[in-house]
C-alpha cells in the first residue's frame, strides 16, 4: 500500500484520522518539510524576545532581542545584556575593564592590552579600557644614530622656533 | 509547557513599595539562577537583579541597590522583587526571566521570560 502521506507538502500534515487526507497546519503551528504527520507549535517570542520573521505554515517564527541585548547561540535561543565599550559582563552586572584590559565591542570580555616587546616594540600609543596598545618602532629603530629609512631633518640654527 | 508569569505590578506613588511575584511552571526553579530585568517607556531592556540556585547569592544594578530585594521559593517554584522607595525612574515593564543552561560560566544569557507586569510611579 502506498504512503500518502509522502504526497503531503510543506504546511500540511498526514491527518491519520481522515484516511491520510493532507491537513493545512492548525494557527501557530507549521510544518517545514512535506510528509509530516503532525506540525510543530510555533515559537512564541515574547519578554526579552522580540518577533523578527511572523511563524508561517511552512517556517518557524524567528526572534530577536530586545535593544539592550544582543543574541546567543543557535536561532537566538537566549538573549544576553550589552555592556558599553570598556566593561565586561559578569553575573553582577556590567563591570569596567581591569587596568591593563580593554573590550571595543558592547559583548565579550576584557582582553589584555598587546605586549608590544614581545615583538620587539614599543607603545606608540597607550591601551585604554575601550582600545588595545598601538605598537610602534622597536625601541632600536627609535635610538640616536639608528638607520632610518627617512632622511634627518635639516638641522636649525640655535634660537629659531620651528615655524 | 516552560513558561514563566509576573503579578504584582501596578499604579504606586514615589516613595512607595511593591512586591512583584513570578510564578514558574513546566520547569525545576531551583535548577536555573533567576533574574528580574525591565523596560522603561521607550528604552531598552535594562537588567535589575539576579539571584543563584539557592539565594546564596544576589546582584543588583547601582540604580536600585538599597530599595530593592530579589529573593526565591523554590519549593513554591516562584520568585518575588520587593521594591521600597520608588521613584518616577523605576517606571517600566519587569519581566521575570531565566538564566540559560551554563549561566555564570559559559555566558549570561536569559532563555525564557514571561510577558511582563507593568509598574507605574507617579503622583
Known amino acids: 500500500l502506498q504512503d500518502l502521506c509522502s504526497n503531503c507538502p510543506a504546511g500540511t500534515f498526514c491527518d491519520n484520522n481522515r484516511s491520510q487526507i493532507c491537513s493545512p497546519c492548525p494557527p501557530n503551528s507549521f510544518s517545514s518539510a512535506g510528509g509530516q504527520r503532525t506540525c510543530d507549535i510555533c515559537r512564541q517570542c515574547k519578554g526579552v524576545f522580540k518577533t523578527r520573521k511572523e511563524c508561517s505554515s511552512t517556517s518557524n517564527a524567528e526572534c530577536d532581542c530586545i535593544s539592550g541585548y544582543h543574541c546567543l547561540g543557535a536561532e537566538c535561543s537566549m538573549c544576553e545584556q550589552d555592556c558599553k565599550q570598556g566593561q565586561e559582563l559578569t553575573k553582577k552586572g556590567c563591570k569596567d575593564c581591569c587596568f591593563g584590559t580593554f573590550n571595543d565591542q558592547k559583548r565579550g570580555i576584557c582582553r589584555p592590552w598587546t605586549n608590544c616587546s614581545l615583538d620587539g616594540k614599543s607603545v606608540l600609543v597607550n591601551g585604554t579600557k575601550e582600545r588595545d596598545v598601538v605598537c610602534g618602532p622597536s625601541p632600536a629603530d627609535l635610538s640616536p644614530g639608528a638607520s632610518s629609512a627617512t632622511p634627518p631633518a635639516p638641522a636649525r640654527e640655535p634660537g629659531h622656533s620651528p615655524q | 509547557q516552560v513558561q514563566l508569569v509576573e503579578s504584582g505590578g501596578g499604579l504606586v506613588q514615589p516613595g512607595g513599595s511593591l512586591r512583584l511575584s513570578c510564578a514558574a511552571t513546566g520547569f525545576t526553579l531551583s535548577n536555573y539562577w533567576m533574574n528580574w530585568v525591565r523596560q522603561a517607556p521607550g528604552k531598552g531592556l535594562e537588567w535589575v537583579a539576579n539571584i543563584n540556585q539557592d539565594g546564596s547569592e544576589r546582584y543588583y544594578v547601582d540604580s536600585v541597590k538599597g530599595r530593592f530585594t530579589i529573593s526565591r521559593d523554590n519549593a513554591k517554584n516562584s520568585l518575588y522583587l520587593q521594591m521600597s522607595s520608588l521613584r518616577a525612574e523605576d517606571t517600566a515593564v519587569y519581566f521575570c526571566?531565566?538564566?540559560?543552561?551554563?549561566?555564570?560560566?559559559?555566558?549570561?544569557?536569559?532563555?525564557?521570560s514571561g510577558q511582563g507586569t507593568t509598574v507605574t510611579v507617579s503622583s
Open positions: 526571566a531565566r538564566g540559560g543552561e551554563g549561566y555564570g560560566v559559559d555566558h549570561y544569557g536569559l532563555d525564557v
